[in-house]
């Protein structure tokens, strides 16, 4: 056959769906690839073609869309199952052609399975919630186009594998589930199952989230240094081990990039000549608060070194702090010597 | 056992002001739940009025409450407070404390109300 | 604000009737709504939450049904300690303003016939 455009396999495309259910799946082409939509292309005389390569096979195969009840149809660039098989796993292509244009591209589907408590190999989105914020929300993902706005599906949302139907700060509203007061014990994984009828029969749709509670921006502050301080003073000898901690903490704030970095006589480390190692910790609090902790080291400190200036700096989406910290040479211990006095005696 | 008790209900002049208390027993108020307080005119219908969430102090008001009501608590007393500002008349009621009203759940409980009386 | 409606305001009936009486949301509360049985002279006790969920200790012939704007409770035989008011309470919040509202109905009063 004459040349197609292959984008190959899109794996950042990692689709999973949910065996029994029904699953809707857009050809990536027009989402990624391409410039111009599916009715641009089907206007133009464009064909779009469907065909896959079972899991565990390297034969491409045509998708049979006469199985009963329709089970797998295509409609526009949607591929539809009603509902998935375990074995629909694989790559699945679609391909628009015409006689002078083609291009193509994979991408991967694999059908889990789920337990009664929702448990799955399934990967999950994360919805952060602010502690103690007030009303927030989350809604069912992934439902749109599943059936028409005329259809009330009923919703049933569950916290793990519990119904919330009990929850004195949780109410269930449809499509979303209402926080009224996020605390960190509401912290787990939500589903919701939408149920819905089509032609005589009922299907559901599971969808899973992770719900995390983070500090909330009510609370942020800039970031605060714990050390150095004006406590603490780096006394030593030269010769020594210079190691000077610089602890930052930072309150969450959603996207804020947190950094911490020494200056050493209003340069960074890396622009002067002494040889000194930094090491980064970071730990995080229940809600997500960071503490990072970079700790400067000279293995053999000079006495130069310790009349530099070391400034520990930090900067989040609320500011920009610094500290200096107190470094200083041992003065030596006075020697006292003894002399011994002699030829005092009297005459 | 698990109970509410109201206390402090009585007659005041209209523009005067009251302090409602509900000591809960059984429960701790460290604990997650909604406490409200309540009101039921003579031969009328009920009414909410406000509700504090216990663990953390958050706190909804009815929009015709809000500014002349204050609702409060003491964890420590495990006990439950409204303070009533500029009383009218329309204020005459037995006010109930409820815990988990505010989104009820099967744990539910009331006191047995406290009688507010304002007339000149 | 919601407005929960209730009806009828009273109604007379015989022990053994069936009874049913409806609350009527002013906006979408889904299953968010509870019924509530008072006497003369007490507190209101809660009967059914989540729309149709029986509160412990409470009799099998009280049933809740509904979701969304229309409500229903039904003593499916009414007995003579069933003879009282009852309230429905809806609960609701806004997208818009972050509201939560809640209302009580005004109050069916079921007596004897």
């Known amino acids: 056959s004459e040349r197609c455009d292959d984008w190959g396999l899109d794996t950042m495309r990692q689709i999973q769906v949910f065996e029994d259910e029904p699953a809707r799946i857009k050809c990536p082409l027009f989402e990624h690839f391409l410039k111009f939509n599916y009715s641009t292309a089907h206007s133009a005389g464009l064909t779009l073609i469907w065909y896959w390569t079972r899991q565990d096979r390297d034969l491409e195969e045509p998708i049979n869309f006469r199985l009963p009840e329709n089970r797998i149809s295509k409609e526009k660039d949607v591929l539809w199952f009603r509902p998935t098989l375990l074995n629909d796993t694989g790559n699945y292509t679609c391909m628009l052609r015409n006689t002078t244009y083609c291009s193509k591209v994979a991408f991967p589907l694999e059908v889990v399975q789920k337990d009664s408590c929702f448990n799955s190999p399934m990967k999950l989105p994360v919805h952060k919630l602010y502690i103690e914020y007030g009303i927030q929300r989350i809604t069912c993902p992934n439902v749109d186009g599943y059936f028409p706005s005329s259809v009330k599906p009923t919703i049933t949302w569950y916290m793990g594998c519990y119904k919330i139907q009990n929850f004195n700060n949780v109410i269930p509203e449809g499509m979303n589930l209402s926080f009224l007061i996020a605390l960190i014990s509401n912290n787990g994984n939500y589903t919701c199952v939408v149920t819905y009828p089509e032609n005589g029969r009922t299907f559901h749709l599971t969808r899973t989230l992770t719900v995390k509670v983070v500090g909330s921006p009510k609370n942020a502050v800039p970031p605060v240094i714990h050390s150095p301080n004006d406590h603490v003073v780096y006394e030593k000898e030269p010769g020594e081990e210079l190691l000077i901690p610089c602890t930052v903490y930072f309150s969450f704030l959603m996207d804020s990039r947190n950094e911490v970095w020494w200056t050493i006589d209003g340069k960074k480390p890396d622009d002067i000549t002494i040889d000194v190692t930094i090491n980064e910790s970071i730990s995080h609090s229940r809600t997500e608060d960071e503490t990072r902790t970079q700790i400067l080291s000279i293995k053999k400190v000079t006495s130069e070194d310790l009349k530099r200036s070391y400034v520990c700096h930090a900067r989040s989406a609320k500011g920009e702090v610094a500290k200096a910290a107190k470094v200083k040479q041992k003065v030596p211990a006075p020697r006292y010597t003894v002399e011994l006095a002699c030829g005092f005696g009297a005459t | 056992q698990v109970q509410l008790q109201e206390s402090g209900g009585d007659l005041v002049q209209p523009g005067g002001s009251l302090r409602l208390s509900c000591a809960a027993s059984?429960?701790?108020?460290?604990?997650?739940?909604?406490i409200c307080w309540v009101r039921q005119a003579p031969g009328k219908g009920l009414e909410l009025v406000a509700c504090?969430?216990?663990?953390?102090?958050?706190?909804w008001y009815a929009s015709w409450a809000k500014g002349r009501f204050t609702i409060s608590r003491d964890n420590s007393k495990n006990t439950l407070y409204l303070q009533m500002n500029s009383l009218r008349a329309e204020d005459t009621a037995v006010y109930f404390c409820?815990?988990?009203?505010?989104?009820?759940?099967?744990?539910?409980?009331w006191g047995q109300g406290t009688l507010v009386t304002v007339s000149s | 604000d919601i407005v929960m409606t209730q009806s009828p305001s009273s109604l007379s009936a015989s022990v053994g009737d069936r009874v049913t009486i409806t609350c009527q949301a002013s906006e979408d509360i889904y299953s968010n709504l509870a019924w509530f049985q008072q006497k003369p002279g007490q507190a209101p006790k809660l009967l059914i939450y989540g729309a149709s969920t029986l509160a412990s200790g409470v009799p099998s012939r009280f049933s809740g049904s509904g979701s969304g704007t229309e409500f229903t409770l039904t003593i499916s035989s009414l007995q003579p300690e069933d003879f009282a008011t009852y309230y429905c309470?809806?609960?609701?919040?806004?997208?818009?303003?972050?509201?939560?509202?809640?209302?009580f109905g005004q109050g069916t009063k079921v007596v004897i016939k």
């Open positions: 059984g429960f701790s108020f460290s604990s997650n739940y909604w």
């Open positions: 504090i969430y216990t663990s953390t102090g958050n706190t």
């Open positions: 309470l809806g609960v609701c919040t806004d997208i818009s303003t972050d509201d939560l509202y809640n209302a």
């Open positions: 409820a815990r988990d009203l505010l989104v009820v759940t099967s744990f539910n409980l």
